[in-house]
């Protein structure tokens, strides 16, 4: 079977707040079985920003129907932009397990935020 | 205009480090991801390193990944990637490049060249 | 990784003439390629991006075409100072990103 590769391909996002923001991630197989999770930020203090087996998370929708068995799409798009969404968005393959465990990372893609247009 | 001068180049032996800078000017530096791309002797272009607008997402070559770093700082509008356990191998021209929308490269500096050599 | 495969190497051809320069992906890129264009003692200069949008300044003799694996560079009526040589590059996949080997257009 083919390695599993998440693709992250923007280094950065520019929006304007108020705005929304869409990062992108791929995967190139679908294996091992578990979800994919983002957060903001790497280390104990990253925050989770989606899960595809929790929710809901209000200002979070995905770009593609991620219920499907065989979607490799998990862009996401985050509402309503505010400076305090500006950071680092890894994209992450857990394995599934009890409790699942992370398997790879994205390379990242740093969003900033630029001040809304007057 | 947009300009990228680079500095830093010279000739140096296997194992030793150096730093090479990127001058830009003529545009909005902080809002461009930039890279830095090489060209051994006679040879054809490798894509080395590159960085996020704001310095949080940094990606490399595989060739490179652990003893180069790139880094910049947007106050200064300077690219910078700095260059320790140099190989032979590592000898080229090494290019700053300006990223634009998307990760291909609308503007070039003349190159400064780096020679490892015992 | 992605790898790039141009061809031909070489390609002499007389001013005037049509040069048709290939370069083949071996995984799909869709239309996330780019053609630069580097003469001797000089930086690559963007050419083509997008597999089919010239760059500004660009002169409508170069063309661009495909998508997926194969591309096309096409410079008609090729003037003295478009001899020199053409790469290929890759993106939109994340690290690494990729060029092709090269092709030379030279004087025949």
């Known amino acids: 079977e083919e390695e599993l590769q998440i693709i992250q391909p923007d280094k950065s996002v520019s929006v304007a707040a108020g705005e929304s923001a869409i990062l992108h991630c791929t995967i190139t197989s679908l294996f091992p079985v578990g979800p994919i999770q983002w957060f903001r930020g790497a280390g104990p203090a990253r925050v989770l920003i989606y899960n595809q087996r929790q929710g809901p998370f209000p200002r979070v929708t995905t770009v593609s129907e991620t219920t499907k068995r065989e979607n490799m799409d998990f862009s996401i798009s985050i509402s309503n932009i505010t400076p305090a969404d500006a950071g680092t968005y890894y994209c992450i393959k857990f394995r599934k397990g009890s409790p699942d465990t992370e398997f790879k990372s994205g390379a990242g893609t740093e969003l900033s935020v630029r001040a809304k247009p007057s | 205009d947009v300009q990228l001068v680079e500095s830093g180049g010279g000739v140096v032996r296997p194992g030793e480090s150096l730093r090479l800078s990127c001058a830009a000017s003529g545009f909005a530096f902080s809002d461009h991801d930039m890279s830095w791309v090489r060209q051994g002797p006679g040879e054809g272009l490798e894509w080395v390193a590159g960085?996020?607008?704001?310095?949080?997402?940094?990606w490399y070559a595989d060739s490179v990944k652990g003893r180069f770093t790139i880094s910049r700082d947007n106050s200064k509008n300077t690219l910078y990637l700095r260059l320790f356990s140099l190989r032979t191998e590592d000898t080229a021209i090494y290019y700053c490049?300006?990223?634009?929308?998307?990760?291909?490269?609308?503007?070039w500096g003349l190159g400064t060249l780096v020679t490892v050599s015992s | 990784e992605i790898v790039l495969t141009q061809s031909p190497g070489t390609l002499s051809l007389s001013p005037g003439e049509t040069a048709t320069l290939s370069c083949r992906a071996s995984?799909?890129?869709?239309?996330?390629l780019a053609w630069y264009q580097q003469k001797p003692g000089q930086a690559p200069r963007l050419l083509i991006y997008d597999a089919s949008s010239r760059a500004t300044g660009i002169p409508d003799r170069f063309s661009g075409s495909g998508s997926g694996t194969d591309f096309t560079l096409t410079i008609s009526s090729l003037q003295s100072e478009d001899f020199a040589v053409y790469y290929c590059?890759?993106?939109?996949?994340?690290?690494?990103?990729?060029f092709g080997g090269g092709t030379k257009v030279e004087i025949k």
């Open positions: 490049a300006r990223e634009s929308w998307n990760t291909f490269f609308d503007y």
């Open positions: 960085i996020s607008l704001r310095g949080g997402v940094t």
């Open positions: 995984q799909n890129v869709r239309s996330n």
């Open positions: 590059q890759q993106y939109g996949n994340g690290p690494p990103l990729t």
